[in-house]
């Protein structure tokens, strides 16, 4: 007894073409580029039936259905623009995303077609969803500022300073949106005991009740770093469980490009804000801030050589500023934050420094502020970052 | 950001009817050719398919299972709901539900733990 | 239900090829789908549409099907590759897993 005529879905056709099917003869069915079969909504990778005794197919006749690459996934600080025509997901359809503007950048062009395997794929060939990327560096402030010898900042000033509460208070500098960069005396004992580490951003006034909390996922503390026995390599960095919202309060600042270098010569400003000691003793209620010009490294060691600071001593992983008068300086309580530069080129803010050590006198004559120089740990930072 | 997360007891005596509710993120429920699957696995053992729904409300059990189950969905409120009649102590298991997306299951919940115990 | 059947374990040492097989009735016919599970954590799609890799998943996994058998290759295995790996295919309209597979990496 034959099997009736199959016939062809729609957008496909039928492979072999007989007169007659008989007994266990057989045909597939193959659909056309940008269409799959599907039977139900599962998809098929290849077709065929077999006519059997009773005269009937084995299976039904599967659909050529159009590829849908359904509805794109949100894309994390962004959204997605439909150009093809409004929800239109279907094969060669396009579609754009784009990042919040002002905070957020993309690093490709965003646009997206449904290809015929059934996945957004970008002109790169990527099937992975494109990534905003914080925009670093952007301050309200503009130089001029005088911790020691500091005066307020504003909001928007300073949106990568966060404050570190522990059993002291220290500081830290947002460098991505997950990623905080500080100094390994101010987190040492916490890679363990990271429960007591309290993350806040978004704040100016120390003491505020709004503000942005993070909690740390993971500590690392550099591996050259000796607690107790000076400061070399006095640089850490903390892995936020969350990654933080961006906006104008709160921003990562840049790490430095090679050519910063060039930015941190000696007598060039840098600025550093913080929370800690002012003139008058006491921690700071509200986020200072001072602009202090780099100090020639060999003037520096040599004051600290005629002045020691027990145990420490200036090494070449270090940058030195202040004035020789004093009277500017970072001081306790400012660890870990950072010291910033203007890339007068990308007119975006770098991270030179990282508050260390100094005095116990801070902002004596000739009591410069030490700190970690940040470009000689850019290999180490971006290990950390891309192997987490 | 695609997200999926079960909820639903963590204890179930035998003979009840167990409830699991999946709450998804990031897709639709209702558009393109997306589903959304119940699997499990008892303890220290392999994975199980029980059911799905497609966004064509397309629905399939595990043919062992199929008196047992139910599998519905709430476009508006983003959630597949499961349940499970005359639990039994070896339906003990974790119970995830994950999308799926041309034929693969590409995004999984962190999973459930449900124990069926007098 | 159709059965998928992988072996057991698997050991390999780091940095040489692992190959997984999953074995069912005219499996090559159908779409094959890989998993990696580690301890503690919900699967992970590794291979879809036999020999697909979706976004995230590193180069040296790979996929092949034909025949009976659909197989997994880990390339230059490392030690977090370390997990239980699951074959899934479609019969129908429902979906059947593997056995399940071991890797483990020798120290």
């Known amino acids: 007894q034959p099997c009736p005529d199959p016939t062809a879905p729609p957008n496909g056709h039928i492979s072999p073409v007989q007169a007659t099917y008989v007994l266990k003869d057989s045909f597939s069915v193959f659909c056309k580029t940008g269409f799959e079969l599907l039977q139900g909504s599962v998809p098929l990778k290849s077709f065929t039936a077999v006519c059997q005794k009773d005269g009937s197919w084995d299976r039904p006749i599967p659909e050529c259905s159009i590829i849908d690459c359904g509805p794109p996934d949100d894309l994390p600080n962004g959204h997605v623009d439909y150009i093809t025509g409004p929800e239109v997901t279907t094969y060669k359809a396009v579609i754009q995303y784009s990042c919040e503007e002002t905070f957020y950048t993309m690093s490709s062009n965003g646009k997206y077609v449904c290809e015929a395997d059934g996945f957004w794929t970008s002109s790169k060939g990527e099937k992975s969803l494109p990534v905003c990327k914080p925009v670093c560096g952007l301050s309200t402030h503009t130089s001029g500022g005088r911790i020691i010898g500091g005066q307020p900042a504003k909001p928007g000033d300073f949106p990568w300073q966060v404050l570190l509460l522990g059993e002291t208070t220290a500081a830290g500098a947002l460098i991505h949106d997950d990623w905080v960069l500080t100094a390994a005396h101010a987190v040492y004992g916490k890679t363990e005991a990271m429960s007591s580490l309290d993350i806040r951003m978004g704040i100016l006034k120390r003491l505020s009740l709004i503000y942005t909390q993070a909690w740390p996922e993971a500590v690392f503390i550099h591996e050259g770093y000796t607690h107790g026995a000076g400061f070399d390599n006095d640089i850490a960095l903390i892995k936020l469980k969350n990654k933080v919202t961006i906006n104008r309060n709160i921003m990562p600042i840049c790490l430095p490009r090679k050519e910063a270098a060039s930015l941190m010569k000696t007598d060039f400003v840098g600025t550093v804000a913080g929370w800690g000691l002012t003139q008058k003793g006491f921690l700071a209620r509200n986020l200072m801030f001072v602009d202090i010009p780099i100090v020639d490294h060999q003037k520096c060691a040599t004051a600290y050589t005629k002045q020691p600071y027990p145990g420490a001593k200036v090494t070449v992983n270090m940058l030195c500023a202040g004035l020789d008068r004093g009277g500017k300086d970072s001081c306790r309580g400012d660890a870990g934050g950072a010291l910033v530069f203007l890339d007068n080129e990308t007119q975006r803010w770098f991270v030179g420094g990282i508050v260390s050590w100094g005095s116990i006198n801070c902002g004596g004559s000739e009591q410069y502020g030490v700190y970690t120089k940040v470009t000689n740990y850019i290999p180490w930072i971006e290990n950390i970052i891309n192997n987490f | 950001q695609v997200t999926l997360k079960e909820s639903g007891p963590v204890l179930v005596k035998p003979t009840e009817t167990l409830t699991l509710t999946c709450t998804v993120s990031g897709f639709s429920l209702s558009r393109g050719k997306m589903g959304v699957s119940w699997i499990r696995q008892p303890p220290g053992k392999a994975l199980e398919w029980l059911a799905h729904?497609?966004?064509?409300?397309?629905?399939s059990y595990r043919t062992s299972l199929k008196s047992r189950l139910t599998i519905s969905k709430d476009t508006s409120k983003n959630q597949v709901v499961l349940t499970m009649t005359n639990m039994d102590p070896v339906d003990t298991a974790t119970y995830y539900c994950a999308r799926i997306r041309a034929g693969g299951i590409d995004y999984w919940g962190q999973g459930t733990l449900v124990t069926v115990s007098s | 239900q159709p059965v998928l059947t992988q072996p057991p374990s698997v050991s390999v040492s780091p940095g040489q090829t692992a190959s997984i097989t999953c074995s069912g009735d005219?499996?090559?016919?159908?779409?094959a789908y890989w998993y990696q599970q580690k301890p503690g954590h919900s699967p992970v799609l590794v291979i879809y549409?036999?020999?697909k890799r979706p976004s995230g998943i590193p180069g040296r996994f790979s996929g092949s099907n034909s025949g009976n058998t659909a197989t997994l290759t880990i390339s230059g295995t490392q030690a977090m590759d370390e997990a239980d790996y699951y074959c899934?295919?479609?019969?129908?309209?429902?979906?059947?897993f593997g056995t399940g597979t071991k890797v483990t990496v020798l120290a």
């Open positions: 729904i497609f966004s064509s409300d397309e629905k």
């Open positions: 549409q036999d020999n």
């Open positions: 899934q295919a479609w019969d129908s309209s429902t979906a059947v």
């Open positions: 005219k499996l090559g016919d159908k779409f």
